[in-house]
């Protein structure tokens, strides 16, 4: 990985636009933490693994992972 | 319809400091990292500086570090790159340019927008 | 440091053939850290591709890119009077930069 010595954040630009769950092979939600001081969303995509940064304030963004998360209740026991 | 418009160019001493805009417009500045990208006269580009959407992460070429600083004010839509100790080396025309929509350390989605430059001559 | 080679320097075609730009890296690159620009003679430069081998927005399909490891490379199938220009690659690697090969050069036979 390019920057892992001297990253702070994961992002460098972020999207609005959902992605469709059923393209999704991952998501990821980064906390803030003393390394990087806002909350990263990571989708990676089943499509050649491409990996796109979410903005987590777009409503677009947060509707996909309520139905993300709610997918996740109905799978496990 | 998507637009970025550089400023700032013009003659300079060596020595002397310059500051380049970059007005963006046509999207939302604010969701996406910025570049400068310079293009030295009958020569290849050169990668300058880049600058994370929301200007927590700034990164520089090692030809530029220490003398060059990338900025930006999300509330002006606008993009910054103040230009010190200027050399007859930094001689170009300086082009902004837009970080591909969720690029991020693992993937890069290039640039995708560029504006059509301005032009920096360092000369005595 | 990560550099990069572009060959052939020029590249003289006519209209209707196809062509072959290659950029090669001194040591391997990640396919999702490669990109590909044209530029047009005062022109600012425009994204081909990104991740080696993703179309940007707008570009038609007879720009494609392949490639892996060491080795990339940009096909136009069949030339356009309008595809004549400067064609470079970009890898995105660590420190972080953001690294342009020299160029090539498609002009008209």
């Known amino acids: 990985v390019p920057l892992s010595r001297t990253v702070r954040c994961t992002c460098i630009s972020i999207s609005n636009q959902p992605v469709n769950p059923r393209s999704l092979e991952k998501l990821e939600i980064i906390p803030a933490s003393q390394f990087c001081p806002r909350v990263e969303i990571i989708a990676t995509m089943k499509k050649k693994g491409e990996k796109r940064c979410l903005n987590p304030e777009s409503k677009a963004i947060k509707n996909l992972l309520k139905a993300v998360s709610k997918e996740r209740s109905k799978r496990s026991p | 319809q998507v637009q970025l418009v550089e400023s700032g160019g013009g003659v300079v001493q060596p020595g002397r400091s310059l500051r380049l805009s970059c007005a963006a417009s046509?999207?939302?500045?604010?969701?996406?990292?910025m570049h400068w990208v310079r293009q030295a006269p009958g020569k290849g580009l050169e990668w300058v500086a880049v600058?994370?959407?929301?200007?927590?992460?700034?990164y520089y070429a090692d030809s530029v570090k220490g003398r060059f600083t990338i900025s930006r004010d999300n509330s002006k839509n606008t993009l910054y790159l103040q230009m010190n100790s200027l050399r007859a080396e930094d001689t170009a025309v300086y082009y902004c340019?837009?970080?591909?929509?969720?690029?991020?350390?693992?993937?890069?989605?290039?640039?995708?927008?560029w504006g059509q430059g301005t032009t920096v001559t360092v000369s005595s | 440091e990560i550099v990069l080679t572009q060959s052939p320097g020029t590249l003289s075609l006519s209209p209707g053939e196809r062509a072959t730009l290659s950029c090669r890296a001194s040591?391997?690159?990640?396919?999702?850290?490669l990109a590909w620009y044209q530029q047009k003679p005062g022109q600012a430069p425009r994204l081909l591709i990104y991740?080696?081998?993703s179309r940007a927005t707008g570009i038609p399909d007879r720009f494609s890119g392949s490639g892996s490891g060491t080795d990339f490379t940009l096909t136009i199938s069949r030339l356009e009077p309008e595809d004549f220009a400067v064609y470079y690659c970009?890898?995105?690697?660590?420190?972080?930069?953001?690294?342009f090969g020299p160029g090539t050069k498609v002009d008209i036979k």
């Open positions: 340019a837009r970080e591909g929509e969720g690029s991020n350390i693992y993937f890069f989605y290039g640039m995708d927008v």
């Open positions: 046509g999207f939302t500045f604010s969701n996406y990292g």
């Open positions: 600058i994370d959407f929301a200007g927590i992460n700034k």
């Open positions: 040591q391997s690159v990640s396919s999702s850290y």
């Open positions: 991740g080696a081998s």
């Open positions: 970009q890898q995105y690697g660590s420190s972080p930069i953001f690294t």
